[in-house]
């Protein structure tokens, strides 16, 4: 968490931004949120990105005033402008590109005073991982698929019943590039799996973390996924 | 409210060019992105460019080389070029304001101005 | 180019009908998908936008979901006044591009 104030004391607000990461081809957020003002038409609202010449996206007078947008931007952000008046300055991001990772700053004035504050943004791309037991195997074989990463992660294996094991030997791990050329999917398999026992397929990057498990037994196949983003400070 | 009126459709001869106007109100041309769409007779809607806010421009690739989009932010107004026409050019030919910023969909649309290509 | 597949190209139907159109992308476009609706001679209508987000009066027995690169625009009860084309469109990258249309005709 980032929180900013104005310069000079008396006129200054506080102004609260997070730290995030964009999934590159989806849509992201960028989090901000200061002191509200009572009248809309006196807030302004200004998001610039570090080494950026124009802007990423301009707010004021209860409307978006985008004619400084720099090209990068162009027809990929907007404000919840219904939101403005509670404080939310919080900007949308449509479809994230590699290169809109970097320092961005949420700029305000309203009538009680100026603030801002910095986020850092990563952008890279994370997926859900899915365990399966791969039939098609000649010994008990686990198959872990997630099919959007980058950059390229580290996949380890766990397993409740063998705690602190290490099954790198027993497992194998590929990257395939997938057709726009950035993100990959990834495959791990593990091998010589024993029933009665939750396996873990961990998919970690400098951007997120994901754990596909999957509890097999004699009667049944139990699955759950999860997905952490790493790395979300406020500020 | 918000409008959108084109102006400037009428017959053009085969090869030269033809420039449409597209006058709008109710919304700042420096807040929003206008976009270009065109119908042939009794056929789909094809997306020919945009002009955004800033002034910068995106265009479909098949019309790169034929078309020119400017504005005057002063008098609310987007101007439309293309060069050298043929008879496939014949459409309706629309503005269009985006629902948001973000572009989510075309909410307000000018009555079209007919264009027609013919010798 | 994404291309936007439409179906059915034509559909008949009589008032108070639940009707469905589909719109398929040929690669994901998240949910920058919208619906038209048009009638001969005048310009689209903006029904859906954001794929699942109605437009400002337009009439609750419209809606769309989906996303990536499935569509769908139902119509729960079918009035005299929806017999029109219907277009899909998607402006997640350039070129935007739009389905052929479905023409909804009374039965």
């Known amino acids: 968490l980032i929180i900013g104030f104005g310069i000079s004391g008396r006129h200054s607000i506080t102004v609260t931004t997070v730290a995030s990461a964009g999934n590159i081809g989806e849509d992201g957020i960028l989090s901000c949120t200061f002191e509200p003002d009572i009248k809309l038409s006196d807030i302004v609202i200004q998001w610039l990105k570090e080494g950026v010449i124009g802007l990423v996206h301009e707010f004021k007078e209860g409307k978006d005033e985008l004619s400084e947008q720099d090209e990068m931007f162009r027809g990929r952000t907007a404000v919840f402008a219904d939101q403005v008046i509670v404080g939310n300055a919080s900007l949308r991001l449509k479809n994230v590109q590699l290169t809109d990772a970097g320092t961005y700053k949420c700029y305000i004035i309203t009538s009680k005073g100026k603030g801002n504050a910095n986020l850092e943004y990563k952008t890279g791309a994370f997926s859900m991982p899915e365990v399966n037991v791969d039939y098609n195997a000649s010994s008990e074989t686990l198959r872990c698929e997630a099919p959007r990463w980058f950059p390229q992660p580290t996949v380890v294996w766990a397993s409740q019943v063998d705690q602190g094991a290490n099954f790198s030997e027993v497992s194998n791990t590929s990257f395939e590039l997938n057709s726009e050329n950035v993100t990959m999917k990834v495959v791990s398999v593990l091998y010589n799996v024993t029933i009665n026992n939750t396996y873990s397929c961990m998919i970690e990057n400098d951007i997120a973390k994901a754990t596909g498990d999957i509890k097999v037994t004699e009667s049944e196949i139990k699955r759950r996924s999860h997905l952490q983003l790493l790395n979300s400070k406020a500020s | 409210q918000v409008q959108l009126v084109e102006s400037g459709g009428g017959v053009v001869q085969p090869g030269r060019s033809l420039r449409l106007s597209c006058a709008v109100s109710?919304?700042?041309?420096?807040?929003?992105?206008v976009q270009w769409v065109r119908q042939a007779p009794g056929k789909g809607l094809e997306w020919l460019a945009v002009i955004w806010s800033s002034g910068s421009t995106d265009y479909n690739a098949a019309f790169l080389s034929r078309l020119t989009i400017s504005k005057d932010n002063s008098k609310n107004t987007v101007y439309f070029q293309m060069n050298s026409l043929r008879a496939e050019d014949t459409a309706v030919y629309y503005c269009?304001?985006?629902?948001?910023?973000?572009?989510?969909?075309?909410?307000?649309w000018g009555q079209g101005t007919l264009v027609t290509v013919s010798s | 180019d994404i291309q936007m597949t439409q179906s059915p190209s034509s559909l008949s139907a009589s008032v108070g009908d639940r009707v469905t159109i589909t719109c398929k992308a040929s690669e994901k476009v998240g949910t920058y998908v919208s619906w038209y609706q048009q009638k001969p001679g005048k310009a689209p209508k903006l029904l859906i936008y954001?794929?699942?987000n109605r437009y400002t009066g337009v009439p609750s027995r419209f809606s769309g979901s989906g996303s990536g690169t499935d569509f769908t625009l139902t119509i729960s009860s079918l009035q005299p006044e929806d017999f029109a084309t219907y277009y899909c469109?998607?402006?997640?990258?350039?070129?935007?591009?739009f389905g052929q249309g479905t023409k909804l005709e009374i039965k």
């Open positions: 469109g998607q402006t997640y990258s350039y070129p935007f591009t």
């Open positions: 954001g794929a699942s």
């Open positions: 269009a304001r985006d629902v948001t910023t973000i572009v989510e969909g075309f909410a307000h």
């Open positions: 109710g919304f700042s041309l420096t807040s929003y992105g």
